[in-house]
Amino acid sequence: LPSCKEDEYPVGSECCPKCGPGFHVRQACGEQTGTVCEPCSPGTYIAHFNGLSKCLQCQMCDPAMGLRTSRNCSTTANALCGCSPGHFCIIQDGDHCAACRAYATSSPGQRVQKGGTESQDTLCQNCPPGTFSSNGTLEECQHGTKCSKWLVTEAGPGTSSFRWV
């Protein structure tokens, strides 16, 4: 293969000028004619100067994988996928996400220590003794009720999930 400049590509023993972003090669250059380029059709793209005979397929952001489109595909740039609301990335692919997972739900008796982000799951923590969380969505566990001195007995012991009165 010939040694071509950065903005040219090899065709046989010759070098042809590349097509620009958003175009692919319709006809390679020849003795008399330059490179004839053709725009990428909708749903395809090429981001760089190139000697490709076909444009690349835009990636689809599959909701079943917890993905949503964060940047639409254009003829010069691929679509970018992000996580749907309530999801975080579990497979990073360069500057975008290939798969997401729904945030973990804190159980009753736990609090949300740190809310989920695009890249991190929700962090749950057990409620400390004497506190409770009935649904696992609270950032702080609540203190259990203390019986007043006028009440002789508690109806039952409290747990981290339930409050007895």
Epitope: E8, C19, C29, Q32, G34, V36
Partner: antibody, heavy 117, light 108 residues
């Protein structure tokens, strides 16, 4: 000798339409790609559109895409340019040119299109 | 798109002098560059193609050179009819086909 004769130019209001024609003679019209090139008053040359010999491929400059339509009738040896939604910046002399290997080897004398209210 | 930059914008010379016109491309166009001459009120005329090939009927005082990104049109001895505007045009990677902004060769 190759001859190309443009017609159809004139004064039109912004948003209006015009259809340019280019009558070709003295060569086998159906064997050549054809082009439209324009030149605004006092300015340089700007490629507008191209069509291959059998109309298989058509290309437009971004500035006219979606507004202009190039076509040809090989039985009449005529090239056309339908111009819609005309703007002031489309004011120019419009040349039709015969294409050979990406070159413009013969040109017509041009027709003036003026877009003004 | 490939941008072509011509220099100088205007060249003031006398008949019999040598004219050197430059055309620089923003990226490689290979050898696929043409030169045209345009006189006032007239259509452009093809002078040079493939960087250095003279078109049919063009006098040999016109010559072209260069490849890749840098091209030159030389008129060895200016004749009175050579005073005009000259445009370069690339067809190395198209569409779009692009032209330089032109160089005016005027009488000094």
């Amino acid at each position: 000798e190759v001859q190309l004769l443009e017609s159809g130019g004139g004064l039109v209001q912004p948003g209006g339409s015009l259809r340019l024609s280019c009558a070709a003679s003295e060569f086998t019209f159906s064997s050549y790609a054809m082009h439209w090139v324009r030149q605004a008053p006092g300015k340089g040359l700007e490629w507008v559109s191209s069509i291959t010999s059998a109309s298989s491929y058509i290309d437009y400059a971004d500035s006219v895409k979606g507004r202009f339509t190039i076509s040809r009738d090989n039985s009449k040896n005529t090239l056309y340019l339908q111009m819609n939604s005309l703007r002031a910046e489309d004011t120019a002399v419009y040349y039709c040119a015969r294409g050979t290997r990406g070159l413009f080897d013969h040109w017509g004398q041009g027709t003036l299109v003026t877009v003004s209210s | 798109e490939i941008v072509l930059t011509q220099s100088p914008g205007t060249l003031s010379l006398s008949p019999g002098e040598r004219a050197t016109l430059s055309c620089r491309a923003s990226r490689s166009v290979g050898k696929y560059l043409a030169w045209y001459q345009q006189k006032p009120g007239q259509a452009p005329r093809l002078l040079i193609y493939l960087g250095s090939n003279r078109a049919s009927g063009i006098p040999d005082r016109f010559s072209g050179s260069g490849s890749g990104t840098d091209f030159t049109l030389t008129i060895s001895r200016l004749e009175p009819e050579d005073f005009a505007v000259y445009y370069c045009q690339q067809y190395g990677s198209s569409p779009p086909i692009t032209f330089g902004q032109g160089t005016k060769v005027e009488i000094k």
